[in-house]
């Protein structure tokens, strides 16, 4: 534990005038001036009534204020004459004396009160010397410390009882112990008085030192009876932007150019790449201009920037579809979460970019239009003989933080011959328990000679699709089940390939027992 503090309540060593303590009887203890080991003048009390038996000499100090102390320590310095070295004395010679105290709420003692006896006085101990001296020796000074408590009144008196010794009370010091204010675990604990008993543990509540935060509570330290701290409970640690210093007694702000993102005992760290701090105590370093952190980036990650444009965009047009491929940007901005977006613009007339507008929603991108991880996309459902501009954007986790739009590489293409347009309507000519006879109008825009039609159909309950082809714009679907609902779609094929399927149309077979009645029915798309 930390060193104990001792606070003096009374010390005769610093008294140069008369102590004027009360002695009883007056023939007992006598105040005498003397000198200590350093030849400083001191006031002492002596008694040496060894030739008379039945001695009962009392000496009482002045009133000593308690100052809220519960346990008082008394340091006694004294010399005692060896009884054997004094000739012609009765057997009542003693080499010990008794220490007492008496509590009071004010200085009420007099020459006769309290009575000079144990109870009302409270005995602390019988004091015996470690060394006594003979007449031929220099007086050997003994030092003894005793304590007593708990005290509850405003103050107390000390009393010394001699029962036939030859001794000198060189100095008396009354003091108390306390635990010095201390810093432990980044917490400050105040100066704390010891408890009433030597074994007492007094709880001192702690507070975090400046720029520290609690990590476990409650914050307390125990002050033991010897004025030493023990058993720390709870702790603080340096807050963000601060690091330990001076053996964990300080939390020092991070100097400019460094930061500390998390509370704890770690040191401040230099700012990550592309970031800086301009003031002390930074918990995060701010990014340089045009550098950013994504929301998911930690404070200790480097600041990064947006990627440069993709390189080498190549287009491969096939009728009204195309494949775009490209290479990685030269500069990834310091990140590994690169994605690509493909922006489609349809251009009108012979004008430049100003005559281009966003593509229709029906244009299809595979695997997708936005957030591509691969450097390839298949684009379909474009118009035939139409100019398009495709912008391939490179984006990463900080593109959304930049005020500028993503960097891109553009490619211009013109589509060629298109597949036929959608078959508009399906008509049911007849149905039976096992077949449906259907016809349809040709596509509005065949975009060439229609070679054949492909029909896809499935039973709604089962969901397994089958296909048939027909050179004509009608077909009989056989092998069906009675009382079943079927979904049917048709598409036309030219040399340019298949057109889109017609919208799903629904037809029902008759029951097995029902006739194959002619049901001329136009089925518009669902």
């Amino acid at each position: 534990g930390c060193r104990a503090l001792e606070e003096t309540l009374m010390d005769t060593k610093w008294v140069t005038s008369e102590l004027a303590w009360t002695s009883h009887p007056e023939s007992g203890w006598e105040e005498v001036s003397g000198y200590d080991e350093a030849m400083n003048p001191i006031r002492t009390y002596q008694v040496c009534n060894v030739r008379e038996s039945s001695q009962n000499n009392w000496l009482r100090t002045g009133f000593i204020w308690r100052r809220d102390v519960q346990r008082v320590y008394v340091e006694l310095k004294f010399t005692v004459r060896d009884c054997n070295s004094i000739p012609n004395i009765p057997g009542s010679c003693k080499e010990t004396f008794n220490l007492f105290y008496y509590e009071a709420d004010s200085d009420v003692a007099s020459a006769s009160s309290p009575f000079w006896m144990e109870n009302p006085y409270v005995k602390v101990d019988t004091i015996a010397p470690d060394e006594s001296f003979s007449r031929l020796d220099a007086g050997r000074v003994n030092t003894k410390v005793r304590s007593f408590g708990p005290l509850s009144k405003a103050g107390f008196y000390l009393a010394f009882q001699d029962q036939g010794a030859c001794m000198s009370l060189i100095s008396v010091r009354a003091f108390y112990k306390k635990c010095a204010s201390t810093t432990a675990g980044f917490a400050l604990f105040p100066e704390t008085l010891t408890g009433a008993e030597p074994t007492s543990l007094v709880i001192a509540p702690g507070t975090c030192i400046p720029n520290a935060v609690e990590v476990s509570v409650p914050l307390k330290l125990y002050c033991n009876g010897d004025g030493e701290w023990m058993v720390p409970v709870g702790a603080c640690t340096c807050a963000t932007g601060h690091e330990p210093a001076a053996k964990e007694s300080q939390c020092r702000p991070c100097p400019p150019g460094s930061y500390k993102a998390k509370q704890g005992e770690g040191p401040c760290l230099p700012c990550p790449p592309n970031s800086r701090t301009t003031s002390p105590a930074a918990s995060i370093c701010t990014c340089h201009n045009n550098f950013y952190r994504a929301d998911s980036d930690s404070a200790d990650s480097a600041c990064t920037t947006v990627p440069s444009p993709p390189r080498g965009v190549i287009s491969n047009v096939n009728e009204t579809s195309l494949i775009l491929e490209w290479s990685e940007p030269r500069d990834l901005g310091g990140r590994d979460d690169l994605l690509y977006n493909v922006i489609c613009k349809k251009c009108h007339g012979a004008g430049g970019a100003s005559a281009c507008s966003r593509c229709d929603d029906n244009v299809e991108f595979v695997p997708r239009q936005l957030g591509l991880t691969e450097r390839r996309v298949h684009i379909s459902h474009l118009l035939a003989h139409t100019r398009y501009t495709f912008e391939v954007q490179a984006v990463n986790g900080v593109s959304g933080k930049s005020p500028l739009p993503p960097r891109y590489a553009a490619v211009n293409i013109t589509t060629n011959q298109a597949a036929p347009s959608e078959v508009p309507t399906l008509r049911l000519h007849s149905s039976s328990g096992s077949s449906l006879t259907l016809s349809w109008a040709p596509p509005e825009r065949p975009n060439g000679v229609i070679l054949d039609y492909e029909m896809k159909y499935f039973e709604k309950s089962e969901g397994i699709a089958s296909t048939v082809t027909s050179q004509m714009n009608s077909v009989q679907l056989d092998g069906l089940r009675p009382d079943a609902r079927y979904v049917v779609q048709v598409r036309a094929r030219t040399v340019a390939g298949y057109g889109q399927y017609s919208r799903p149309a629904e037809f029902e077979t008759t029951s097995e027992r029902g006739s194959g009645a002619q049901q001329l029915q136009e089925q518009l798309p669902l």
Epitope: S434, F458, E459, K460, S461, E462, G463, I464, D478, G479, L480, R481, R485, V487, P504, E506, L526
Partner: antibody, heavy 114, light 112 residues
Framework: QVQLQQPGPDLVMPGASVKLSCKAS????????IHWVKQRPGQGLEWIGQ????????DYNQKFKGKATLTVDKSSSTAFMQLSSLTSEDSAVYFC???????WGQGTTLTVSS | DIVMTQAAPSVPVTPGESVSISCRSS???????????LYWFLQRPGQSPQLLIY???NLASGVPDRFSGSGSGTAFTLRISRVEAEDVGVYYC?????????FGAGTKLELK
């Protein structure tokens, strides 16, 4: 891709009713029937019935008539099955499927207990 | 109702070997249109059933060609050649010839 989303487990008191849902996505909802199948813990599969989302016509397994009622909400592409007068025998996993051949939803575990 | 019977509740198999799972129906599933409306499903542990074979012998989309289906009007077999760990689960046969649709009790494929 085709998906049928069914909510998580449900705990219901005996005698009560419950309405299980099945939200379809990734295809045209009205093109395929929705089937419902029951699977008791550690048991096989029992077909409850089917519904055509285009006109809400239904076919039920005779065993589940009066117990199950199938409905759809075309606007949200969601099929529903209401089970009434619940007993512990109704504690099971209930699957919905797009047509009899699937795909199937992940199933909703229904526990009937007081 | 058509009753579907899977006699074997479980079949043990060593990975890499072949296995056959059988199913019988109480009525012929061969329709006059020439299709046999018998389907095989696999239900892996903790998952929902997935289609393997439709109309007795057609392999469903995305299913490995290790699986094959065969049979007559009332007796059907699902064969798995070179069994893999991912094939573990319960195999169900189902008829969709008429309503109500009915399932077999299931056969559990276990690895030795």
């Amino acid at each position: 891709q085709v998906q049928l989303q069914q909510p998580g487990p449900d705990l219901v008191m005996p005698g009560a009713s419950v309405k299980l849902s099945c939200k379809a996505s990734g295809y045209t909802f009205t093109n395929y029937y929705i089937h419902w199948v029951k699977q008791r813990p550690g048991q096989g599969l029992e077909w409850i019935g089917q519904i055509d989302p285009s006109d809400s016509s239904t076919d039920y397994n005779q065993k589940f008539k009066g117990k199950a009622t199938l409905t759809v909400d075309k606007s949200s592409s969601t099929a529903f099955m209401q089970l009434s007068s619940l007993t512990s025998e109704d504690s099971a996993v209930y699957f919905c499927a797009r047509s009899s051949t699937g795909p199937w939803g992940q199933g909703t575990t229904l526990t009937v207990s007081s | 109702d058509i009753v579907m019977t899977q006699a074997a509740p479980s079949v043990p198999v060593t990975p890499g070997e072949s296995v056959s799972i059988s199913c019988r129906s109480s009525k012929s599933l061969l329709h006059s249109n020439g299709n046999t409306y018998l389907y095989w499903f696999l239900q892996r542990p903790g998952q929902s059933p997935q289609l393997l074979i439709y109309r007795m012998s057609n392999l469903a989309s995305g299913v490995p060609d290790r699986f094959s289906g065969s049979g007559s009007g009332t007796a059907f077999t699902l064969r798995i050649s070179r069994v893999e760990a991912e094939d573990v689960g319960v195999y169900y046969c189902m008829q969709h010839l008429e309503y109500p649709l009915t399932f077999g009790a299931g056969t559990k494929l276990e690895l030795k």
